[in-house]
């Protein structure tokens, strides 16, 4: 079998709400993958598990199942998301995410998102990782590419 | 019934380009892949490359990279094969073929189209 | 590139008579095989796909086995139509390779 490509675009958007009792902020972040069907042949794109990281703590956990069929020397872009929860010992961030004073409320997120290619009743996965910005002040539409995080600790593709 | 009609001989001058054509009739033309075949006169096969008519996503033979260029119009249901830079190596016999696949079975080059003579000559 | 080795090159033979050609692959290549026929006008004609299935419409007497690296096809008895040119094909990877050929005459 030839290769089976999954990129990790970016952060497509990032809805926010609040709960002020709690003190606790929910983000559902959605995310688009491209992936690439280098094969001669289908591969059906089974599942993909994703997850979410703040600060070294699972923030947000996401599965889809029987997504799509790719046909051979093809392209599709995928969006799923991933809903989010920033509380208890990370509750602190909500004093930031609700500042008045700032207008952009970027955190680094680390998305890690793994893919579930089949053919031929054999299955392959593809995982990759990505530090990204989400504004977690307000609901954000982001152009693909604009959020990413780049420094050292980002992964080289 | 499934037929592949290719365009007719093409006499060209050395140094310049050809487009053969292969139209699809009686099936569904994007749900197949659509392979390229070259034969010299007198020789046996040789892959040039494949093109998923749907997306127009293509592979080739490391060979014919920078010679040929695949294209299909999903409109008249038709590939092309356009040769360039052309020399008398490129003088043969070229088919076209379709490929079935799906996400169980691949068995590739079920029928044929009944190839187009090129000659290049000044 | 996975190089398909066809032998013999040409064959005389006989009505009647049973032949087999040979394609030997310098990797492993499965069941991912193809046989394919071409008559003196030019037209190519698949007789057997996955080494030894028979497509639709080819007569029984054309059969196709694989033993290690090596594909044979087989036909059991031949008419005065099967005098042409047959050739494998290899499409477990890219690119795909065919045999040189084989000359079927008659005696």
């Known amino acids: 079998p030839r290769s089976i490509d999954v990129k990790y675009i970016g952060v497509k958007s990032a809805y926010v709400s609040y709960d002020v009792q709690k003190r606790t902020i929910y983000l559902n972040i959605t995310n688009t993958l491209n992936i690439t069907n280098n094969n001669y042949y289908s591969v059906e794109v089974e599942n993909i598990t994703a997850q979410v990281q703040f600060s070294k703590t699972v923030i947000g956990k996401a599965r889809l199942n029987n997504i799509t069929i790719i046909g051979p020397l093809d392209m599709k872009q995928i969006d799923y998301t991933v809903p989010t929860v920033i509380a208890e010992e990370m509750s602190y961030m909500y004093d930031f995410c609700t500042l008045i004073s700032i207008k952009v409320h970027n955190i680094v997120l680390m998305m890690q998102v793994t893919v579930t290619t089949t053919y031929f009743g054999h299955s392959e996965q593809i995982s990759q990782e990505r530090y990204q910005y989400v504004d977690c002040g307000r609901n954000t539409t982001y152009q693909l590419g604009q959020s990413e995080y780049l420094n050292v600790l980002q992964p080289q593709q | 019934q499934v037929q592949l009609q290719q365009s007719g001989a093409e006499l060209v001058r050395p140094g310049t380009s050809v487009k053969v054509s292969c139209k699809a009739s009686g099936y569904a033309f994007t749900n197949y892949l659509i392979e390229w075949v070259k034969q010299r006169p007198g020789q046996g096969l040789e892959w040039i490359g494949v093109?998923?008519?749907?997306?127009?996503?293509?592979d080739y033979n490391e060979k014919f990279k920078g010679k040929a260029t695949l294209t299909a119009d999903k409109s008249s249901s038709t590939a092309y094969m356009q040769l360039s830079s052309l020399t008398s190596e490129d003088s043969a016999v070229y088919f076209c073929?379709?490929?079935?696949?799906?996400?169980?079975?691949?068995?590739?080059?079920?029928?044929w189209g009944q190839g187009t003579s090129v000659t290049v000559s000044s | 590139d996975i190089q398909m080795t066809q032998s013999p090159s040409s064959l005389s033979a006989s009505l009647g008579e049973r032949v087999s050609l040979t394609c030997r692959a310098s990797?492993?290549?499965?069941?991912?095989l193809n046989w394919l026929q071409q008559e003196p006008d030019g037209t190519i004609k698949r007789l057997i796909y996955?080494?030894?299935s028979l497509d639709s419409g080819v007569p029984k007497r054309f059969s196709g086995s694989r033993s290690g690296s090596d594909y044979s096809l087989t036909i059991s008895s031949l008419e005065s139509e099967d005098f042409v040119d047959y050739y494998c094909?290899?499409?477990?990877?890219?690119?795909?390779?065919f045999g040189g050929g084989t000359k079927l005459e008659i005696k």
């Open positions: 073929a379709r490929d079935p696949y799906s996400k169980y079975v691949h068995y590739p080059m079920d029928y």
């Open positions: 990797q492993d290549i499965g069941s991912s």
């Open positions: 094909l290899q499409y477990a990877s890219s690119p795909r390779t």
């Open positions: 996955a080494t030894s």
């Open positions: 093109i998923n008519p749907g997306s127009g996503g293509t």
